[in-house]
């Protein structure tokens, strides 16, 4: 005989759980034990079947979850699952908030990315850092040039995916070139975009010659400027 | 070509449920946020819900949330809209729209492609 | 929520001429990317809307010239340089800034 314990304690890292209203939201928490232990959920520490909210809630024993669609304002609290058997019992807390702000197209900090000169053999980090209300998902474009164009015949410009993420909101993301030679120079462009729209900044590398040894051992490895 | 085509239209009790889908063809459906947008008859134009690229983010009018449901299937090219509890006032014409994409906007960033429509009439 | 404003009500024009609609939203639509983001649409009788600008003042593929879009921050014009018979239609601004995504409430334009 066991008592019950976590079996994917990774997968309950996540504690707080920040959502927009209308989201569907998940708890999960597999567990196992000898006797199989049973699974049951309390909102702000009284049991909770989910009658007196509108669409109800989907409970699935087999995958130790408890499923709420269209989330409103009065779904926020410590939701909590409790896993017992004749052994013993374990839980779990989380908390959920619903966030009711009006979502909006990503935001990028002004200036960045920042327009940069290096000297070829050096490396380079372009940084954008973006705000959001829904998750955004992040690419990095290198503008190219086909057949001596920039430009294809509808006015846009010819562009290449360098690095695509989906990160959280408010971090900083990176694109690192490593050892730039002359061919990485030219524009660069952060394109963040979510639910509601996209939103792009660019910035031009420019990357020189391998400069005097003397004159390079007193100089930094690259130079941001704007 | 990029098409639109909404169904599941129909004449619905107050307090009864139905659900709309969009069928999307001539674009990659599962790279696009998307939209339901309804017009009431001889009315303007009001904003319903959004569902991100993956299906993983989702917004509601006020006047509809929690109550309706926006959802997704990829390997179907479908938008859905599950209408629960309808209301008189929930009786509109209801486009289904394609958002923002993923990847460089050449041209807008979505709001350029609608369906025809279908016609949702709830009443007693 | 952000409302969006539009006048006239009604437009009616004697084809050649030119017809101006205005659109004011209560907030400023101007993003930190530069760019603003109104749109225009016309709505053809019995149809779905029809993009014609998009962010401020760029013409959707296949829009006349004679369409053309301008205004800053809060206080957006559509015009029209010289109105034709299949113009007709109600025009809609809309804010593309932030959900909930809002529209103007229509100018019907009409032939004389």
């Known amino acids: 005989q066991q008592a019950p314990y976590w079996t994917h304690p990774q997968r309950m890292e996540k504690k707080l759980h920040a959502v927009p209203a209308g989201n569907t939201v998940k708890f999960r928490c597999p567990a196992a034990g000898n006797p199989t232990p049973t699974i049951r959920w309390l909102k702000d520490g009284q049991a909770f079947h989910g009658e007196n909210r509108i669409g109800g809630i989907r409970l699935r024993h087999q995958h130790w979850s408890l499923v709420m669609e269209s989330v409103v304002p009065s779904d926020r609290g410590t939701y909590t699952c409790l896993v017992e058997n004749a052994v013993g019992s374990i839980r779990y807390n989380y908390l959920l908030d619903v966030l009711e702000r009006s979502p909006h197209r990503p935001i990028l900090q002004a200036g960045l990315p920042a327009n940069t000169t290096a000297v070829v053999g050096s490396d380079v980090e372009l940084l954008c850092k973006v705000y959001s209300d829904a998750q955004p998902h992040i690419q990095w474009l290198k503008h190219i040039v086909i057949n001596g164009s920039s430009f294809g015949a509808d006015g846009f410009p010819y562009v290449q995916v360098l690095k695509t993420a989906d990160i959280n909101s408010s971090e900083v993301e990176v694109l690192y070139l490593r050892n730039v030679s002359a061919e990485d120079a030219g524009e660069y462009t952060c394109l963040a975009g979510n639910s509601i729209g996209l939103s792009y900044q660019s910035a031009w590398l420019t990357v020189l010659p391998e400069e005097d040894p003397t004159w390079t051992a007193a100089a930094p490895e690259a130079r941001y400027t704007d | 070509e990029v098409q639109l085509l909404e169904s599941g239209g129909g004449v619905v009790q107050p307090g009864r449920s139905l659900r709309l889908s969009c069928a999307a063809s001539?674009?990659?459906?599962?790279?696009?946020?998307m939209h339901w947008v309804r017009q009431a008859p001889g009315k303007g134009l009001e904003w319903v819900a959004v569902?991100?690229?993956?299906?993983?983010?989702?917004y509601y009018a006020d006047s509809v949330k929690g109550r309706f449901t926006i959802s997704r299937d990829n390997s179907k090219n479908t938008l859905s809209l599950q209408m629960n509890s309808l209301r008189v006032e929930d009786t509109a014409i209801y486009y289904c729209?394609?958002?923002?994409?993923?990847?460089?906007?050449?041209?807008?960033?979505?709001?350029?492609?609608w369906g025809q429509g279908t016609m949702v009439t709830v009443s007693s | 929520d952000i409302v969006m404003t539009q006048t006239p009500l009604s437009l009616s024009v004697t084809p050649g001429q030119p017809a101006s609609i205005s659109c004011t939203s209560s907030?400023?639509?101007?993003?930190?990317?530069?760019?603003?983001?109104v749109y225009w649409y016309v709505q053809k009788s019995g149809q779905p809307p029809q993009l014609l600008i998009y962010?401020?003042?760029n013409r959707f593929s296949g829009v006349p010239d004679r369409f053309s879009g301008s205004g800053s921050r809060t206080d957006f014009t559509l015009k029209i340089s010289r109105v034709e018979a299949e113009d007709v239609g109600v025009y809609y601004c809309?804010?593309?800034?932030?959900?909930?995504?809002?529209f103007g409430g229509g100018t019907k334009v009409e032939i004389k």
């Open positions: 809309m804010q593309y800034i932030e959900a909930p995504l809002t």
């Open positions: 907030r400023s639509l101007l993003h930190s990317d530069g760019k603003t983001y």
């Open positions: 729209v394609r958002g923002a994409g993923l990847g460089f906007p050449y041209g807008p960033d979505g709001f350029d492609i």
């Open positions: 569902i991100s690229y993956d299906g993983s983010n989702k």
């Open positions: 001539g674009f990659t459906f599962s790279s696009y946020a």
């Open positions: 962010e401020l003042s």
